[in-house]
Amino acid sequence: SEVEYIAEVGQNAYLPCSYTPAPPGNLVPVCWGKGACPVFDCSNVVLRTDNRDVNDRTSGRYWLKGDFHKGDVSLTIENVTLADSGVYCCRIQIPGIMNDEKHNVKLVVIKPAKVTPAPTLQRDLTSAFPRMLTTGEHGPAETQTPGSLPDVNLTVSNFFCELQIFTLTNELRDSGATIR
């Protein structure tokens, strides 16, 4: 199943995807689409690159802010809304028949909550639940495999709503995580 990345409404979401150009500088076309990667190309294309640059964007909110020329084709979606939630496909279109690399990533957009969890709860949340928090301008540089989590310092305010905080607190207590 896809790795999940979480962003708050109004924040920027970061969906990682990368490849290693071989040889360096030998870029290949990439498309990002809304929906799981289909057999061919991308469905509902939101952004497309050619061998040189981004040549198709369906909205000014979609950006490649990483080092595109080194194969970092991670997608940044600015000012996300609940409608941006869902699975996205990053397709690295390597020449040849059926050579494409396909990566499905899931974006979960949440409403800003009215409460701020304690710092330790923030950290424990990230260690107890293998989902990426992607509220900053940039996120982890590499695609994570399901179940893994980069050891990054996450500062997320207004994370979940009160009910979710309560539920997660109980789950963390059951899992042995520290709660203060």
């Epitope: 929906g35 799981a36 289909p38 057999v39 061919f40 190309d41 469905s43 699975v87 028949i97």
Partner: antibody
Framework: EVQLVESGGDLVQPGGSLRLSCAAS????????MTWVRQAPGRGLEWVAN????????YYVDSVKGRFTLSRDDAKNSLYLQMNSLRAEDTAVYYC?????????WGQGTLVTVSS | ETVMTQSPATLSVSPGERATLSCRAN??????LAWYQQKPGQAPRLLIY???TRATGFPARFSGSGSGTEFTLTISSLQSEDFAVYYC?????????FGGGTKVEIK
């Protein structure tokens, strides 16, 4: 108005060849994947082959690989399917369709009958 | 290959009634599923794509739902022009495959 018009269907003997054509109009042909889908008489639909916008990649269902060749001529807004070593099981109406994964416009079809 | 199974093969419905058509995949196809309508002597017409997005030209009485392996096409109130054969098609796995079709006929 988008239009796709197939031609070239005929009665042919097993082992024979045919070339189907699809003339496209009403859209920018060169920016779309194009596809052939077939339907045997009284039967369901079967995807046959498709071709990328620039012609750099062509894909075929296993049952026609090595026998059918897909090509396009963007200057003529046309799609072609060269069918060799035809078999009785290739008998079908062949539809030209626009798209790669799902197909939003279809032609009226051309009937290919393979029989001795 | 991904096998798409449609049921029932034939559905007899009276005009004005609701019709529910099922399509099942033998492996996950996410929401990469389309529905087509085909009338006798005509080419298929795209009806639904991405499991639930209605194509241009079809009214709101047609709706698609489901993801993964189970999908449904619902026609809320059948009109005379809706009697046809309906095919589902997955585009998640190689090769692209269609279901065998469901014929919706007048009861």
């Amino acid at each position: 108005e988008v239009q796709l018009v197939e031609s070239g269907g005929d009665l042919v003997q097993p082992g024979g060849s045919l070339r189907l054509s699809c003339a496209a109009s009403g859209f920018t042909f060169s920016t779309y994947w194009m596809t052939w889908v077939r339907q045997a008489p009284g039967r369901g639909l079967e995807w046959v082959a498709n071709i990328k916008q620039d012609g750099s990649a062509k894909y075929y269902v296993d049952s026609v690989k090595g026998r059918f060749t897909l090509s396009r001529d963007d200057a003529k807004n046309s799609l072609y399917l060269q069918m060799n070593s035809l078999r009785a099981e290739d008998t079908a109406v062949y539809y030209c369709a626009r798209g790669s994964n799902w197909f939003d416009y279809w032609g009226q079809g051309t009937l290919v009958t393979v029989s001795s | 290959e991904t096998v798409m199974t449609q049921s029932p093969a034939t559905l007899s419905v009276s005009p004005g009634e609701r019709a529910t058509l099922s399509c099942r995949a033998n492996q996950n196809v996410y929401s990469n599923l389309a529905w087509y309508q085909q009338k006798p002597g005509q080419a298929p017409r795209l009806l639904i794509y991405d499991a639930s997005t209605r194509a241009t030209g079809f009214p709101a009485r047609f709706s698609g739902s489901g993801s993964g392996t189970e999908f449904t096409l619902t026609i809320s109130s059948l009109q005379s022009e809706d009697f046809a054969v309906y095919y589902c098609q997955q585009y998640n796995n190689w090769p692209l495959t269609f279901g065998g079709g469901t014929k919706v006929e007048i009861k």
